[in-house]
């Protein structure tokens, strides 16, 4: 397409930089901004910084869960995170456990033996 | 607060989050679908554990997690703006929502990450 020879025609085109790149984030600032707008009432407005902040929070929490789940998978000598690893990571961390109350499908259970069930050495129960 | 187990409300602004289903009268009905963050979750995974993969089921769980946290933060921020009679949701409302929703050190570190990102964003404008 033949563009007009405007005052900028001689200048090299600057590459478009996404809002995520400007904020140094992986998560999509533009998309999150759109969702925030759709979540608020019709007359409500959403500032640009709200989307940046939200994206950073979501990215941080994602990194925190994946970090611990990745550690769990490495401890079990597996190279792929599964729901079980997510379960071990979340339930093994006091703060993540209190944040994520939902049941993790396929997560299994957290190993736990009640103190009262652990018999002292040499004290075997007779049937 | 417990995450809502029911289907999310339809998202107006998202083209991707909508598929059309035919109604009996011939009109198209919007069916809401949760936003997918899989691409971004994967990018973050490669930052923290470059040599580790993730199963599709685990990715689905991470996706639900991100959507759930987003809904909680957005809902709380919206309520805060409404209570304080503010017409615009800013990073201030998001920060307060985070402090209210996240426990202890998790909130402190999350706030630090949010502030850092906003500072970098505003300085690069």
């Amino acid at each position: 397409a033949g563009g007009k020879a405007g005052k900028d025609s001689g200048k090299a085109k600057t590459k478009a930089v996404s809002r995520s790149q400007r904020a140094g984030l992986q998560f999509p600032v533009g998309r999150i901004h759109r969702h925030l707008k759709s979540r608020t009432t019709s007359h409500g407005r959403v500032g640009a910084t709200a989307a940046v902040y939200s994206a950073a929070i979501l990215e941080y929490l994602t990194a925190e869960v994946l970090e611990l789940a990745g550690n769990a998978s490495k401890d079990l000598k597996v190279k792929r995170i599964t729901p079980r690893h997510l379960q071990l990571a979340i339930r093994g961390d006091e703060e993540l456990d209190s944040l994520i109350k939902a049941t993790i499908a396929g997560g299994g259970v957290i190993p736990h033996i009640h103190k009262s069930l652990i018999g002292k050495k040499g004290q075997q129960k007779t049937v | 607060p417990e995450p809502a187990k029911s289907a999310p409300a339809p998202k107006k602004g998202s083209k991707k989050a909508v598929t059309k289903a035919q109604k009996k009268d011939g009109k198209k009905r919007k069916r809401s679908r949760k936003e997918s963050y899989s691409v971004y979750v994967y990018k973050v995974l490669k930052q923290v554990h470059p040599d580790t993969g993730i199963s599709s089921k685990a990715m689905g769980i991470m996706n639900s997690f991100v959507n759930d946290i987003f809904e909680r933060i957005a809902g709380e921020a919206s309520r805060l703006a409404h209570y304080n009679k503010r017409s615009t949701i800013t990073s201030r409302e998001i920060q307060t929502a985070v402090r209210l929703l996240l426990p202890g050190e998790l909130a402190k570190h999350a706030v630090s990450e949010g502030t850092k990102a906003v500072t970098k964003y505003t300085s690069s404008k």
């Epitope: 925190e64 611990l68 703060e95 | 050190e105 570190h109």
Partner: nanobody
Framework: QVQLQASGGGLVQAGGSLRLSCAAS??????LGWFRQAPGKEREFVAG???????TYYADSVKGRFTISRDNKRTTYLQMNSLKPEDTGVYYC??????????????????WGQGTLVTVS
């Protein structure tokens, strides 16, 4: 096991600068950071950095004055500028096998190095 060797402490005037170093050896650590203990006070978190992603976290009291960084030789540095008398104390290098500055800052499962004394007059 993890060995942490801290160095770089010393006497400096208020407003001056110091750079602390901490070299890690032994098993792999994912997060390194610094704590400090002022005379008669509890040990407190100062700054931390994750090894792979390079995420940093600072205590509010040092934000904007201290900078934590790392190199590929498993060494972390704490650049301390605009030092104040209240920055005086023994600085300890700490590490954790989890790549989370949050878990490092709680100080629960950390490996610890010997302290290096920083005195701001």
């Amino acid at each position: 096991q993890v060995q942490l060797q801290a160095s770089g402490g010393g006497l400096v005037q208020a407003g001056g600068s110091l750079r602390l170093s901490c070299a890690a050896s032994g098993r792999t650590v994912a997060t390194l950071g610094w704590f400090r203990q002022a005379p008669g006070k509890e040990r407190e978190f100062v700054a931390g950095i994750t090894w792979t992603a390079g995420r940093t976290y600072y205590a509010d009291s040092v934000k904007g004055r201290f900078t934590i960084s790392r190199d590929n030789k498993r060494t972390t540095y704490l650049q301390m500028n605009s030092l104040k008398p209240e920055d005086t104390g023994v600085y300890y290098c700490a590490a954790t096998s989890s790549g989370s500055t949050r878990l490092l800052s709680t100080g629960r499962d950390n490996y610890w190095g010997q302290g290096t004394l920083v005195t701001v007059s």
